[in-house]
Amino acid sequence: IWELKKDVYVVELDWYPDAPGEMVVLTCDTPEEDGITWTLDQSSEVLGSGKTLTIQVKEFGDAGQYTCHKGGEVLSHSLLLLHKKEDGIWSTDILKDQKEPKNKTFLRCEAKNYSGRFTCWWLTTISTDLTFSVKSSRGSSDPQGVTCGAATLSAERVRGDNKEYEYSVECQEDSACPAAEESLPIEVMVDAVHKLKYENYTSSFFIRDIIKPDPPKNLQLKPLKNSRQVEVSWEYPDTWSTPHSYFSLTFCVQVQGKSKREKKDRVFTDKTSATVICRKNASISVRAQDRYYSSSWSEWASVPCS
């Protein structure tokens, strides 16, 4: 058993049918010695008397808020949550496995640049009685500070008979050095509590591996005289690291017909313009990627040929 925060305790339960459970001793936070009784949640049933209460925690029915009283007065509370292990594996029931980029991916994180700011998100199908707490650091043995805000509900989606809730959090490395080579990974730890269930989730990454630039901005077409060709131009996204001479992007330009089945023409360039043939009813799209490190491509920025 360990303390999550003041008066909130997590009981680690290795559960299997007929498991003996965990013996927990609760102590009433009072100088009083006599006439103390204990109850659980809203029940008036007296579970025991005395300054300490010993309970056997076998299941969620044994968790909850234990209160010690004397003469009708509340002396102190202890909220017991369960962190359940089955077959040697801690439960991961609160968050959905996003399965991208691999199985057992519960937290996903992205950064728009090298400033040390990043966003993580996760999915759940639970709509109520749910709280998250996020901590982060660079490295774990001698951790350097990363400050995270509060997790917020960022999206709701209905997919068939599933309703999904997306939560996200923004974090900022306290002393980020954008140009430095990373040697220690960022660690992100999420505590999730649903009712009386506690779970924790972690992710470890280098900023360079989670970079995903914003799409190029100000995408424009300029027709070339007496030609089906157009000059496409664009700019670096505002959110990308500067100077651009050091933090350089490469670009992919794509001409896509109205039908998804039509052949796509693609051009790769390090410049912020390209000349392509604009077919009728086609659209031109441009996306960006770090020029020197193969992290994610941005989403596409698009304009119609017409």
């Epitope: 969620f60 029915g61 089955e86 639970i126 309703k163 009386l196």
Partner: nanobody, 123 residues
């Protein structure tokens, strides 16, 4: 958000078997842990059995252990309670429940309840 409909109750002789079904509908029903409770006249609702959302783990009250089997078919969104070697003291209204805390034998750890199906075991 989740609807539960029990079926399969009836009148049987002691020693016989019965299978109860609980059809679940609504959002995210596959993510719920499911339980069966029962209530005899003049008594509190009592836990019988529970199964986790994956269907990989089950939990039983001592009074039904070895006689009752809980199972689920997530393709059909249905939970079953196979009851064998029934005794007169198994007579009760049987309720299906859905929640997110497994294992729990406490009724208020379940969020959704069916209307119940009557099981009568005569001697």
């Amino acid at each position: 958000e989740v609807q539960l409909v029990e079926s399969g109750g009836g009148v049987v002789q002691a020693g016989e078997s019965l299978r109860l079904s609980c059809a679940a509908s609504g959002y995210n029903v596959k993510d719920y842990e499911m339980g069966w409770f029962r209530q005899a006249p003049g008594t509190e609702r009592e836990f019988a059995a529970a199964i986790n959302w994956r269907g990989s783990s089950t939990y039983y009250a001592d009074s039904v252990k070895g006689r009752f089997t809980i199972s689920r078919d997530n393709a059909k969104n249905t939970v079953y309670l196979q009851m064998s070697s029934l005794k007169p003291e198994d007579t009760a209204v049987y309720y299906c429940a859905a929640g997110r805390l497994y294992p729990s034998s406490r009724s208020r750890d379940y969020d959704y309840w069916g209307q119940g199906t009557q099981v009568t075991v005569s001697s």
